[in-house]
Interface confidence: medium
């Protein structure tokens, strides 16, 4: 008859590698006697004989794990007692071991160009993955600017256009490489304005083309605005080649203008937009009648009939093909100009600009053009159309018009003779003295200085109130 | 005094190009102060503005138009040419060419006495 | 295409005045130009920006244009100036724009 034996392990557990989803198994080969009752724990838990993850086999001896999974990493240990002695144990370690598998995908990404962007890719796998990107077909090296995260997520700093392209991330141990899908990273770039339009100064009835190139991504849309309003498709001639938009506008000049070309690009819910302007003056408004040749004739226009003394000699400029007709026609658009004046503003404002466009005149060896005395010039600005010509400076300070003097022929008062130097040498403007017994009836002109007199602004008990600066003594 | 004179052929197949010249005579099409349009008149209706070449060479077309219309200039012969292909019965109509000048606001202010086209297979 | 609008008939009786109105979204601020035709016959400016006159037309021609209406007035209408009348306009955006034309008759 046996003897009785404790219980000797005689295969120590070892440890185990094994693939999630395969089978592993710990043998724990026992000789004692009587027969051993053999029990398994994990991590110091007694696994349980009805738990279906597991099959123990040949008296307890055989663990079989029948699906790995991660969570069965641990120390197992098999534990035998037959009652001869003490209980022996021997442990051996599950090492589940994974195929490299992406738990979180990059995706793909649209950012503006000179952010950062990240785009992810989170492993799972045991020996832990190596994580590498490529970008095309191409293995993508990391600079100062691009880097690899230990998370395995690619980040790159202030991206660039050459940047946007495909990529996918690879993650890699001793037992596989897993590969993410393609993902697109698009680089957007805020609008930009390559060539901007150009100024002109053309005669009237002329054909202009402004022209605006615009860059970004996505590729902008081009609108104009003429003087603050849309300009409307019809006249507009667009082209687009590599992200670059040419916009065309092609204009016919009756009057001068402000031409604004804005480029404008959606990222997202938000727009960016560049601006850029230029100004199209006619070149007859701003010639300078100094040193001009011309004739003297007498008045045979309409527009200014009401305005010039009758049967009265006025000089025309010949550097204007035909220059009773381009006079004319400049009188007459800056008539339209005048319909939004003031009442007080406007009838002293047509004496000025029918005074100064056709200017009295002297016919003798030289013809020589009379202009307006200073004086009279300055109550037009500071007293009839004060409101107005604060308006006018406001616009051109603000850059909405070259030269300060809108879109009218007006004169530069500053240099215009004064009729305290030479009577003679200047033309009064009849209008401006008749209204000059009136003038109490004027609103006065607020300035930051003390108010002064215009000195013998033709002889009368009233005088204008303008600042001492045009006091022209 | 400009003179202005239109010439082409009277009868044009639908899809075909209609083309038409100008001679213009007392003035050069290169002056600054000028440029040189194309207007219509079918039968019974009103004038229809189709294009203009400017004294530089630069041309604008009518936006109902622009995709079938051309205008070209000879300045050696101070002609220029008008250009209207995939012609239906629709263009039938008088055509006439005109002078805009600056002197008097852009207006026409010399005209051809037209020459009447007409689209037919 | 900028619209202009204008009625297609008007009488007038000889020697009285007619008037033919040309209609446009803020007309008075462009320049209005007016042509004649006669039937057979080119169209002949008989006013240009607004109101001028070229030479040879005569004084009983005249133009006016503010707000949205430019209006041709023929003051004491001759039998010579039954005709078409075409009201025209530049758009700043180099096209030019013509009215559907008015037959003036004159009775």
């Known amino acids: 008859e046996k003897l009785p034996k404790a219980p000797v392990i005689t295969t120590p557990l070892e440890t185990v590698d094994a693939l999630v989803e395969e089978v592993a198994t710990f043998m724990c080969a026992v000789e004692s006697y009587p027969q051993p009752e053999i029990s398994w724990t994990r991590n110091k838990i007694l696994i349980k004989l009805f738990d279906t993850r597991y099959s123990i086999r040949e008296n307890g001896q055989l663990l079989t794990i029948l699906s790995v999974e991660d969570s069965d990493d641990g120390i197992y240990c098999c534990i035998a007692n037959n009652g001869v002695g003490g209980a022996v144990e021997s442990c051996g370690a599950l090492q589940v071991k994974m195929k490299p598998k992406i738990t979180r995908p990059p995706i793909n990404v649209k950012i503006i160009e000179g952010l950062k962007a990240v785009l992810p890719c989170t492993t799972m796998g045991n020996p832990k993955p190596s994580v590498s990107w490529i970008k095309g077909d191409n293995a993508l090296r990391e600079n100062s600017r691009i880097a690899v995260l230990e998370s395995g997520s690619l980040r790159i700093h202030n991206v660039q256009k050459e940047d946007a392209g495909q990529y996918r991330c690879v993650a890699k141990n001793s037992l596989g490489t897993a590969y993410s899908k393609l993902v697109k990273l698009e680089v957007e770039v805020f609008a930009r304005i390559l060539r901007a339009p150009e100024s002109h100064n053309v005669t009237f009835g002329s054909f202009v083309t402004l022209r605006c190139t615009a860059i970004g991504i996505p590729v902008p849309t081009i609108s104009w605005i003429e003087n603050g309003n849309a300009v409307s498709s019809g006249s507009i001639q667009e082209s687009v080649k590599d992200r670059v938009i040419d916009s065309r506008l092609q204009l016919f000049i009756t009057k001068p203008g402000l031409y604004t070309c804005i480029a404008t690009n959606k990222h997202g819910e938000k727009f960016s937009t560049a601006k850029a302007a230029a100004t199209v003056s006619i070149a007859e408004w701003s010639k300078s009648q100094k040193d001009s040749q011309g004739y003297c004739a007498q008045y045979r226009g309409e527009v200014c009939d009401a305005v010039l003394a009758k049967d009265a000699l006025v000089f025309f400029n010949t550097s204007y093909r035909d220059p009773e007709d381009a006079q004319e026609l400049l009188i007459h658009t800056a008539w339209n100009e005048l319909k939004a004046v003031s009442p007080l503003c406007r009838p002293a404002a047509e004496a000025l600009l029918c005074n100064h466009l056709f200017q009295e005149c002297s016919p003798g060896v030289v013809p020589t053009p009379m202009p307006i005395c200073r004086e009279y010039c300055l109550a037009v600005k500071e007293l009839f159309c004060a409101k107005e010509w604060q308006a006018m400076e406001g616009k051109a300070h603000r850059g909405l018009y070259r030269s300060g003097m809108h879109l009218l022929p007006v004169p530069e008062c500053s240099k215009l003779p004064s009729m305290h130097r030479d009577p003679t040498a200047c033309t009064r403007l009849p209008y401006l003295d008749y209204k000059k017994e009136n003038i109490t009836t004027f609103p006065s002109i607020t300035s930051s200085r003390p108010s002064a007199d215009i000195p013998n602004l033709p002889a009368s008990t009233s005088s204008f109130a303008v600042s001492p600066a045009y006091s022209m003594t | 005094q400009v003179q202005v004179q239109e010439s082409g052929p009277g009868l044009v197949k639908p899809s075909q190009t209609l083309s038409l010249t100008c001679t213009v005579s007392?003035?050069?099409?290169?002056?600054?102060?000028?440029?040189w349009s194309w207007i219509r008149q079918p039968p019974g209706k009103g004038l229809e503005w189709m294009g203009v070449?400017?004294?530089?060479?630069?041309?604008y077309y009518s936006p109902s138009l622009k995709s079938r219309t051309s205008i070209s200039r000879d300045t050696s012969k101070n002609q220029f040419s008008l250009h209207l292909s995939s012609v239906t019965p629709d263009d039938t109509a008088v055509y006439y060419c005109?002078?805009?000048?600056?002197?008097?606001?852009?207006?026409?202010?010399?005209w051809g006495q037209g020459t009447q086209v007409t689209v037919s297979s | 295409s900028y619209e202009l609008t204008q009625s297609p008939s008007v009488s007038v009786a000889l020697r009285q005045t007619a008037k033919i109105t040309c209609g446009g979204n803020?007309?008075?601020?462009?320049?209005v130009q007016w042509y004649q035709q006669k039937p057979g016959q080119a169209p002949m400016l008989v006013i240009y920006?607004?109101?001028r006159r070229p030479s040879g037309i005569p004084e009983r021609f005249t133009g006016s244009n503010s707000g949205n209406t430019a209006t041709l007035t023929i003051t004491g209408a001759q039998a010579e100036d039954e005709a078409d009348y075409y009201c025209?306009?530049?758009?700043?955006?180099?096209?030019?724009?013509f009215g559907g034309g008015t037959h003036l008759t004159v009775l």
């Open positions: 005109a002078r805009g000048s600056s002197r008097v606001a852009a207006a026409f202010d010399s």
């Open positions: 007392g003035g050069s099409i290169t002056a600054r102060y000028y440029s």
């Open positions: 070449i400017a004294y530089d060479g630069s041309t």
């Open positions: 803020r007309i008075g601020g462009k320049s």
């Open positions: 920006a607004d109101s």
């Open positions: 025209h306009v530049w758009g700043s955006t180099a096209s030019a724009d």
